[in-house]
């Protein structure tokens, strides 16, 4: 029977008695930076080339005995998870191993850096097909390690790393905190976050997605035919490295941004029990479990978007938080969120020739998050149109006036501290979907984009009575690009996108009480690209 | 994910640039910074990654490393260049006393210095 973890990542159409998806990652090379490995294990024999790279610290303790099977344990198991004959994800992928962890599973930032440099030099000397680098390790936050990962990613390499096994915010660890790296948390057979001893998987906004990482059967270095169960975010990352190899083998031209968006898109959504995570981290942690795409081709027609949360701004009065998209992505909308509800909104602004999403804290606020909606939109030309605070009682409005530009998102930003406390709601006039509406004291920012075949529509869901959460989702075939709250309520904490659903959060109803100001309206902007759909059909 | 400039307070020690013997002063107004792991048991003091500014060539990296060694020797300190980086990041890995950090931060082309630290299998 198929091991639970392989079944979990396999779409139903592949599920037979044996896990045999097409293509197997044969066009892709996966680099593994880990312990030494037992390359003659039946699972990985002939699939893994052991490089001569070794940079490890000495083992701790005078009583440590180097036992070959222990030294090879971690790396052998992971190589098996990625490409093992019986229990591997991408059975066709070839691998190269670099030893950066000693027999106790310990390495150094400097050794890892030199290993990454070795990979880059190998890539320059002998360019091959797509490269995936698996980093099943973690240390404390490291600016230099994150920078090296960024450089390698910008050279076209896909880096996949473990979120860490510290039951903590992954942003406090490297390379997990590097934005360019695909960071993977671990879940178990019940789709619960993995507990390991007193700790467990890391979580938070620096995690891209989760994957099976508990009780994973794979190659054991105890003997050439042995298997063993291992657990951790390394095992989860190995699954994603295998899935990435499969995807890149099917579509070798995929960029890192495209691959990440596809990994997110094809993941199982909302299956993780978020109660395991600390309350303040639940909204930041993606509820996604990695899976292979149901078919290796034909995903190109989709408009892919993801949500990127900023770091917390901190509580000072003028504090701001910035969320950025990857270089190949377009920022299509920007929203903000504050647990205290005290914020001064958000705006899209240019920084280094690229749009970023900036959220503003308010006096007495505990801090804000900026939330960027980052999308893949080829040949896009996007700009931000701003309307300053209006004098008229009807509020501030801004629309996309350029020919062929459509509205993808609305933001509003204000200087006064208590905006909306005693103001009646402002309703959007019907028949004007290309328009953002806000309070008269607020600046309103419209994200307007032109791209071949791009069409968007506005969808609203209003609830007259106060409620902690109001949602509105885009229907099948449409992708959520913008998420905001219609102005007029004092207790809105903010808005953010979760997959294809726009979520508007309000203060706990029990504390605000039911008033005439209780109405909450969530506004979603849903887009699709006819151009991408046509291009996909022409390819097929 | 984490912003490049590191929103997380991994200890950052900025030391003001001052003329120091034969060292060229860094470009006006820029201050190299020192970073170390926030988790104390994972720190590896005595080994440092000196990261140079983005467009620094390999020859300049080697020259900067040699300059650090020469200035350290004048002060009676032994240093060892363990690796010169090029291809991904310009810079070098050096084994030296933490006493020399102030000196190293004033070297030309230095962007930041990070103390080495441990990583672990997950």
């Amino acid at each position: 029977s198929i091991p639970w973890n392989l079944e979990r990542i396999t779409p139903p159409r592949y599920r037979a008695d044996e896990y045999q998806p097409p293509d197997g990652g044969s066009l892709v090379e996966v680099y593994l930076l880990d312990t030494s490995i037992q390359s003659d294990h039946r699972e990985i024999e002939g699939r893994v080339m052991v490089t001569d790279f070794e940079n490890v610290p000495e083992e701790d303790g005078t009583r440590f005995h180097r036992q070959a099977s222990k030294c090879d344990s971690h790396g052998t198991h992971l190589a098996g998870v990625v490409s093992g004959r019986d229990a591997g994800v991408a059975k066709g992928a070839s691998m190269r191993s670099l030893r950066v962890l000693n027999c106790q599973g310990k390495g150094t930032v400097s050794g890892t850096l030199i290993g990454l440099e070795f990979i880059r030099k190998s890539q320059l000397v002998q360019p091959v097909g797509p490269l995936v680098v698996l980093l099943p390790l973690a240390g404390g936050y490291s600016r230099v390690l994150n920078a090296a990962c960024q450089r390698l990613a910008r050279a076209g390499v896909v880096l996949v790393t473990a979120a860490g096994n510290f039951r903590d915010d992954a942003c406090l660890y490297s390379p997990a905190s590097a934005p360019e790296v695909i960071t993977v948390g671990a879940t178990n057979a019940q789709d619960q976050p993995v507990t390991l001893g007193t700790l467990g998987t890391n979580f938070g906004r620096c995690v891209d997605l989760f994957a099976p990482g508990e009780d994973i059967i794979g190659a054991s270095s105890d003997c050439s035919t042995c298997f063993v169960s291992q657990s951790g975010t390394s095992q989860a990352a190995a699954h994603v490295a295998g899935i990435a190899a499969m995807m890149l083998s099917a579509e070798p031209e995929l960029t890192l941004a495209e691959l990440r968006q596809r990994l997110i898109h094809f993941s199982a959504k909302d299956v993780i029990n978020e109660a395991w995570f600390p309350e303040d981290q639940r909204v930041l942690t993606p509820n996604l479990v990695a899976a292979l795409p149901p078919s290796t081709h034909g995903a190109g027609w989709q408009l892919f978007c993801r949500t990127v949360w900023s770091a917390h701004s901190g509580p000072t009065r003028m504090a701001t938080a910035v969320a950025r998209c990857a270089p190949d992505e377009e920022l299509l909308s920007c929203s903000s969120f504050s647990r205290s509800g005290k914020r001064r909104g958000e705006r899209m602004e240019a920084q280094g020739g690229k749009l970023v999403c900036r959220a503003h804290n308010a006096f007495g606020g505990e801090g804000v998050y900026a939330i960027a909606r980052c999308c893949l939109l080829p040949q896009a030309n996007c700009s931000v149109h701003t309307a300053p605070p209006a004098e008229a009682s009807m509020g501030t409005r801004v629309h996309c006036h350029q020919q062929g530009h459509v509205l993808t998102g609305c933001s509003s930003h204000w200087e006064v501290e208590d905006l909306g406390t005693h103001k009646p709601p402002v309703l959007r006039p019907r028949g004007q979907p290309n328009q953002c509406v806000g309070h008269r004291e607020a600046s309103i920012h419209a994200s307007c984009c032109h791209a071949p075949g791009l069409e968007c529509k506005v969808k609203e869901h209003g609830i007259p009575a106060p409620q902690e959460q109001v949602t509105v989702a885009c229907e099948e075939g449409w992708t959520l690009t913008g998420c905001s709250a219609l102005p007029g309520t004092s207790h809105v904490l903010g808005a953010y996108a979760v997959d294809n659903t726009c979520v508007v959060r309000s203060r706990d109803v029990s504390t605000t009480g039911s008033t005439s100001e209780g109405a909450v309206t969530a506004v979603a902007i849903c887009c699709r690209s006819r151009h991408l759909a046509q291009a996909s059909q022409e390819l097929q | 994910q984490e912003d490049e400039d590191g929103d997380y307070e991994e200890l950052v020690l900025a030391l003001r640039s001052e003329e120091d013997g034969l060292a060229e002063a860094p470009e006006h107004g820029t201050t190299a910074t020192f970073h170390r792991c926030a988790k104390d048991p994972w720190r590896l003091p005595g080994t440092y990654v000196v990261v140079l500014k983005e467009e620094t060539h390999l020859s300049q990296s080697e020259r900067t490393a040699r300059r650090l060694q020469a200035q350290a020797a004048r002060r009676g300190y032994l240093t060892k260049i363990l690796h010169v980086f090029h291809g991904l990041l310009p810079g070098f890995l050096v084994k030296m006393s933490g006493d020399l950090l102030e000196l190293a931060l004033k070297l030309p082309h230095v962007d930041y210095i990070e103390e080495d630290s441990s990583v672990f299998a997950q």
């Epitope: 169960s229 291992q230 657990s231 | -």
Partner: antibody, heavy 130, light 107 residues
Amino acid sequence: EVQLVESGGGLVQPGGSLRLSCAASGITFSSYWMSWVRQAPGKGLEWVANIKQDGSEKYYVDSVKGRFTISRDIAKNSLYLQMNSLRAEDTAVYYCARDRGTYYYTEGGYNYYYYGMDVWGQGTTVTVSS
Amino acid sequence: DIQMTQSPSTLSASVGDRVTITCRASQSISSWLAWYQQKPGKAPKLLIYKASSLESGVPSRFSGSGSGTEFTLTISSLQPDDFATYYCQQYNSYSYTFGQGTKLEIK
């Protein structure tokens, strides 16, 4: 689905020997520690011995040390318990069980996380009597 | 060796009752404790591992708690199928010991 089937039980005189076997079906047999547990008539459960995946580590309850030997044959997907110098107090139903557990790493190195005995055989009866 | 003591030895209860079985270790075992259910003539069945984690396929009316030396197994609402003998088991560096068992019978 993993299945465990014990055999080899029977009546034996005090001082005699017996070899119990446990045949496993399902490929995960070789991936886990395995245990023998016994239950004397009308009494509770008593753990007897366990063995690591590759047979390199074995542990025993004090009362059987030096008399019983646990072993496994990965190629045959089988677990064994060689019982020598049998005593009347060894009379029991003997179960083989899979020890579900997993290895994981922390900054301290390699750790073992034990879940419990999640798959059991139906048991084989050993009677030691003259 | 670590001794495990279960209480009570026998427990009479009715369908729908909430019942609690206690297990005490002679020294701290952290959370390394499992609970099993055994019916006459059958092999034991794993219910709870690591003190509080529910084994896959086990009904949610079973729950475990505790750490160190004191542990409890709770059945929130007894069902007819739950009348059986329950054992706790500690794990400590690859050697195990069971409690003497608690027989749960119909009142």
